[in-house]
Interface confidence: low
């Protein structure tokens, strides 16, 4: 049997293999040692018994999408049946005082692999070391602490495989410099020691994406905006645009990145070297925001051809929006047509290639409440004898849209612990002036929060107010 027969049934075309060679990986045309690593078909009853106490789940994650040329990292974590864990020596033990289907477990071994292993196992040429090999019969590496590594992980993608010894977690990074853009599948099979052989305990696969466009995501925030996720913002208040570039391997760290903004409101093109930018829309309406991110990254040198002039360095047009489907876990660009780029083997020349990323959004600008202020605070005269509560009248003004609701939160002087919250619809005159009467339970210092809201906005102001005791000479104090 060959690796491809064991690990995956989808044939990987030969012409693709040539373009997508991974450094340190091997062709899945290699032979698989079926004696040391038995192959079980789906539905084989032995899968059920391959692990004591249940099935081991392998969870595979990656930091996809990856820009061509960057590194992409895959992590496999093994999740053991309930009440089982890996100890410091790499053995699998039952957790103390944990209740599983068998009742309470004591701290006994599920698998005590290191107890039977000794350094003599590594003596090459002896029958004892013949089993310390990967499925392609390569011997295991011998780093410090090898005895604690009880699992063999076989990663398989792009018609190639990579073998690794590990504990309950394994990590592999690949460089995407020679890879074709597009979605790919990574499959991982995990084996455990079983006497002098290795049996499969779990299999997992996941999609990852190689892209020739910079994966870009933009967060948009604005003071007084009621809902940050609805892409509705307020007129006459700055919106903060913050560009996040998905670059977990820091491939772009040494590249200068330029951001070209078109806000769709006829204010022209803004070019910036900063990932954050403020912009204020002064008209209501719907606007198409376009961002192009550009950078130069190390790339292939074009073959010398004196007769052909170099192509102009214009950005390609952004991809069409993806069909509505579940989005990938991290922000990604998955254009419908992937360009494949053959990378030359010339690595000693310092050529650079332009890469682009795109972000588009349709944002709606509406009128909102821009500002709230407390104009006046007045003590409401009370009949004699005075009740325990003090009544205060607050005169509040606002700018912008007419609020529909006013909320008052009375809290402790630190403004942390709310004591009372009252919301009510409001009738506001054309000048946006309203009077709010609130009761205070006894003397002391209070924090008073006023929020005025409408469908799109929520504006806030706070003040500290000192309610005097019942001595008629003690004054009311407000500290804004």
């Amino acid at each position: 049997k060959r690796f491809r027969d064991v690990l995956g049934h989808e044939q990987y075309p030969d012409h693709m293999r040539e373009h997508n060679q991974l450094r340190g990986w091997s062709s899945d045309e290699n032979e698989w040692d079926e004696h040391l690593y038995p192959v079980w078909r789906r539905g084989d009853g032995r899968w059920k018994d391959s692990w004591e106490g249940g099935r081991v789940q392998a969870v595979l994650t990656s930091d996809s999408p990856a820009l061509v040329g960057s590194n992409i990292t895959f992590v496999v974590n093994l999740v053991f049946p309930r009440c089982q864990k890996e100890d410091a020596n790499g053995n699998i033990v039952y957790e103390k005082n944990c209740r599983n289907d068998l009742g309470l477990t004591s701290d006994l071994h599920v698998y005590n692999w290191t107890a039977g292993a000794d350094d003599g196992d590594w003596e090459d040429g002896t029958s004892r070391s013949q089993h310390l090999r990967f499925p392609d019969r390569r011997p295991f590496p011998r780093p410090h602490g090898w005895k604690k590594w009880s699992f063999v992980y076989v990663f398989h993608t792009l018609g190639q495989y990579f073998q690794k010894l590990g504990r309950c977690s394994a990590r592999v990074s690949i460089n995407t410099v020679n890879l074709t853009a597009g979605p790919q599948v990574m499959e991982v099979t995990v084996f455990r020691r079983y006497g002098r052989a290795y049996i499969p305990i779990s299999k997992v696969k996941d999609v990852y994406v190689i892209t020739d466009q910079i994966p870009v995501f933009v967060t948009m925030s604005q003071k007084n905006d009621r809902n940050l996720s609805d892409e509705i913002f307020l007129r006459d208040l700055p919106i903060v645009f913050d560009v996040l570039i998905h670059d977990p391997s820091h491939f772009l760290n040494d590249s200068a990145i330029s951001y070209k903004w078109n806000f769709g409101d006829n204010t022209g093109l803004f070019v910036s070297n900063n990932h954050t930018l403020n912009h204020t829309y002064v008209l209501n309406g719907t606007f198409n925001l376009n961002l192009t991110v550009q950078t130069a990254v190390p790339g292939p040198c074009p073959p010398p051809s004196p007769s052909t002039p170099p192509p102009p360095s214009t950005p390609p047009s952004p991809p069409p929006s993806p069909l509505p489907t579940l989005s990938t876990p991290s922000p990604s660009l998955m254009p419908t047509g992937y360009k494949s780029m053959e990378l030359s083997d010339i690595s000693n020349e310092n050529c650079r290639i332009n890469r682009y990323g795109y972000f588009r959004a349709t944002i709606t600008i509406v009128e909102g409440i821009l500002e709230v202020s407390i104009m006046q605070i007045a003590d409401v005269p009370m009949p004699t004898p005075q009740p325990a509560n003090s009544l205060m009248d607050f005169t509040v003004t606002c700018k912008g849209a007419t609020p529909m609701e006013a909320c008052t939160i009375i809290s402790d002087p630190t403004c942390q612990i709310a004591q009372n919250r009252v919301c009510s619809p409001v009738a506001v005159d054309g000048l946006c002036l309203l009077s709010v009467r609130r009761a205070f339970n006894g003397s002391g210092t209070y924090c008073v929060n006023f929020t005025l809201g409408d469908d799109a906005s929520l504006a806030l102001t706070s003040t500290l107010i000192s309610i005097p005791g019942k001595d008629p000479d003690s004054p009311l104090r407000a500290v804004n």
């Epitope: 049934h9 789906r42 539905g43 599948v185 299999k203 996941d206 579940l326």
Partner: antibody, heavy 120, light 107 residues
Framework: QLQLQQSGTEVVKPGASVKIPCKAS????????MNWVKQRPGKGLEWIGQ????????NDNGKFEGKATLTVDKSSNTAYIQLSSLTSEDSAVYFC?????????????WGQGTSVTVSS | SIVMTQTPKFLLVSAGDRVTITCKAS??????VAWFQQKPGQSPELLIY???NRYTGVPDRFTGSGYGTDFTFTISTVQAEDLAVYFC?????????FGGGTRLEIK
């Protein structure tokens, strides 16, 4: 237009078997998991298992071992569930539902369900 | 297998009310939780995936949150057409398991 088409109703005798089809159209059949979910009348949902048409890989709920077998026919873009040794406990609606490879449990499109009645 | 304990089992609310349903996993399932709506006589429909992501075309009155073992599903302003049974589901561990469901009825 994306569709998962299931047969309407199956009436079968106790001890017999039944094979329920789910015909997919409007998307890349081989690139999505196909899940099967059981729902007894007035009850909740029970996940039976899933199959990846791209390579026939399956991921099963051990509770249905020996009861449910999942297969696919890539040429007709059809997934099947075969239920064997049927009893009254197997009377239920069986849904097929697809899920993307990277979010294999998030079933975003469902068939209309096939009602299986086990009765002598 | 993971047990998903969903509460409450039944909700009787008025149109315009805010509704919260909770789901507790018997062990951590990261953020791999989905929420489904099943209207009478229909197939379930995906509303939320990966705990908090609203599926394409789902109105923004439906939201989800949570991580690890505790998850919450909220309808900010219930409408008459929201009459349905709502299910949570974990898809971190196989077998994937559903909560028992919450029947939402409108007064």
């Amino acid at each position: 237009q994306l569709q998962l088409q299931q047969s309407g109703t199956e009436v079968v005798k106790p001890g017999a078997s039944v094979k329920i089809p789910c015909k997919a159209s409007g998307y890349a059949f081989s690139s999505y998991w196909m899940n099967w979910v059981k729902q007894r009348p007035g009850k909740g949902l029970e996940w039976i298992g899933q199959i990846y048409p791209g390579d026939g890989d399956t991921n099963d709920n051990g509770k249905f071992e020996g009861k449910a077998t999942l297969t696919v026919d890539k040429s007709s873009n059809t997934a099947y569930i075969q239920l064997s040794s049927l009893t009254s406990e197997d009377s239920a609606v069986y849904f097929c539902a697809r899920s993307p490879l990277h979010l294999r449990g998030s079933m975003d499109y469902w068939g209309q369900g096939t009602s299986v009645t086990v009765s002598s | 297998s993971i047990v998903m304990t969903q509460t409450p089992k039944f909700l009787l609310v008025s149109a315009g009310d805010r509704v919260t349903i909770t789901c507790k996993a018997s062990q951590s399932v990261s953020n791999d939780v989905a929420w489904f709506q099943q209207k009478p006589g229909q197939s379930p429909e995906l509303l939320i995936y990966s705990a908090s992501n609203r599926y394409t075309g789902v109105p923004d009155r439906f939201t989800g949150s949570g991580y690890g073992t505790d998850f919450t599903f909220t309808i900010s302003t219930v409408q008459a057409e929201d009459l349905a049974v709502y299910f949570c589901q974990q898809n971190y561990y196989s077998p994937f398991t559903f909560g028992g469901g919450t029947r939402l009825e409108i007064k």
